[in-house]
Interface confidence: medium
């Protein structure tokens, strides 16, 4: 996360580190004792379940026990449009035990349309600056806001590549953004409860004023999530 402050896992108990061969690759969000929500692109290089582990319950990257993964479920990847459908569900081999530092985040409502400038939060262990060289050892957080899709698709930004199933978030002047290593983590909105409204997906650089972070819009995939859960009962 770029433009940040340190976070406590007590504040974000649903945040997990998704690791391959003990190396942090992506963030993710606990949805219930068995399921973690993350980004599909985290698994492009490695699709085997066995070397993937999930770490929950700490704001320090290396200090908490790893959990085995039973299944990784991804919507079919489309090589023509590689940024589409950047959403995945990980099923854990054994259910999580909830505590003060391990708790789920709510899914959004089907009709949850957030207007531009709505305040949101981002978290992650990713780079703290563009080309920043390494991950953060501690969980970082930052406040951002919804950026209008029209602005996000402007000539000096993403030129129409932000689809209706994506959303943009940042701050108008830039400088606050998700970055490498934050992928898969939550974009969060607080109403009465915290909702995961977006999944860290893609962007050009980190923190640029005209190219904010682009997030998978979770409300566009609720049917898919519920269908996966139904099939896995």
């Amino acid at each position: 996360v770029v433009g940040v402050e340190e976070a406590s896992v007590d504040s974000w108990p649903w945040q997990v580190s998704i690791q391959y061969d003990k190396q942090h690759v992506c963030g993710g969000s606990i949805l219930d004792p068995h399921w973690v929500l993350t980004a599909a692109h985290c698994f492009r290089k490695h699709t085997d379940v066995f070397n993937w582990k999930v770490r929950a319950g700490s704001d320090k990257l290396g200090s908490f026990p790893s959990l085995a993964v039973a299944k990784i479920i991804i919507i079919e990847f489309n090589p023509m449009y590689p940024k589409d459908n950047d959403i995945a569900l990980m099923k854990l081999q054994f259910p999580l035990t909830f505590s003060g530092t391990v708790r789920p985040i709510c899914l959004p409502f089907f009709d949850e349309e957030l207007t531009p400038a709505t305040p949101l939060w981002i978290i992650g262990w990713g780079f703290t600056k563009q080309n920043g060289g390494k991950m953060s050892d501690i969980l970082l957080q930052a406040s951002v806001q919804v950026i209008d899709s029209t602005r996000c698709n402007a000539d000096d930004a993403y030129q129409g590549e932000v689809t209706e199933k994506m959303m943009c978030a940042g701050i108008p002047e830039g400088g606050v953004d998700t970055c490498q290593g934050d992928s898969g983590g939550p974009l969060m909105y607080q109403s009465d409860q915290w909702h995961v409204v977006g999944i860290v997906s893609w962007g050009y650089g980190c923190g640029g004023p005209s190219t904010p972070g682009v997030y998978t819009k979770v409300s566009a995939y609720l049917n898919w999530i519920y269908n996966v859960w139904k099939a896995e009962l």
């Epitope: 090589p79 449009y81 030129q159 590549e161």
Partner: antibody, heavy 123, light 108 residues
């Protein structure tokens, strides 16, 4: 400079099979998604299939799904199209194409094209 | 039947400006790309994204979009611009790519 050299076209009977190949040079091959596009004689262009850079993911037009298989060998910088159960309506010039890889634009456009190879399905 | 509709033929006087259009519902959500194809040759990309030209494509070629219509404009048309022009974009499902039927441009 990107070069795409095709082989494998020719005359085949209905129901028969054919494999097209497309050897690429001048491009970091495994970084690019690739595609096949065809053009029936005197007609327009029709997208056929695409494959991701790693080869792990593929996508097909409805007209060829279940009959055609796209694949690639990144060690040989070569793209393939295995065509089975061929029909008269598959008669066309087949082009292989490199999907664009602009930094943040989606890749749904074809940056470089090969010269094309004619496949004729006739008894 | 094409999901993207183009006029079959358009003509233009040498040195004049011509606009070739492409219509389709998917163009409300996605940009078109434009290809030039001369007889016996492979297509060549001339415009992609909102209005991006690959290197080597003259700046007389430009693209624009409005509603369900994408347009390719050639300003100061040259004799060598005579060709068939195809638009392409995502289909209505968003998963596949489709081409328009092509517009044959004749330079008078």
């Amino acid at each position: 400079q990107v070069q795409l050299v095709k082989s494998g076209g020719g005359l085949v009977q209905p129901g028969g099979s054919l494999r097209l190949s497309c050897a690429a040079s001048g491009v970091n091959f495994n970084n690019y998604a690739m595609s096949w596009v065809r053009q029936a004689p005197g007609k327009g262009l029709e997208w056929v299939s695409a494959i991701s850079g790693s080869g792990a993911s593929t996508n097909y037009a409805d007209s060829v799904k279940g009959r055609f298989t796209i694949s690639r060998d990144n060690s040989e910088n070569t793209l393939y199209l295995q065509m089975n159960s061929l029909r008269a309506e598959d008669t066309a010039v087949y082009y292989c194409a490199v999907l664009g890889r602009e930094q943040y634009l989606a890749r749904g456009y074809f940056e470089h094209w090969g010269r094309g190879t004619l496949v004729t399905v006739s008894s | 039947s094409y999901e993207l509709t183009q006029d079959p033929a358009v003509s233009v006087a040498l040195g004049q400006t011509v606009r070739i259009t492409c219509q389709g519902d998917s163009l409300r959500s996605y940009y078109a790309s434009w290809y030039q194809q001369k007889p016996g040759q492979a297509p060549v990309l001339v415009i992609y994204g909102k209005n991006n030209r690959p290197s080597g494509i003259p700046d007389r070629f430009s693209g624009s979009n409005s509603g369900n219509t994408a347009s390719l404009t050639i300003t100061g048309t040259q004799a060598e611009d005579e060709a068939v022009y195809y638009c392409s974009s995502r289909d209505s499902s968003g998963n596949h790519l489709v081409f328009g039927g092509g517009t044959k441009l004749t330079v008078l």
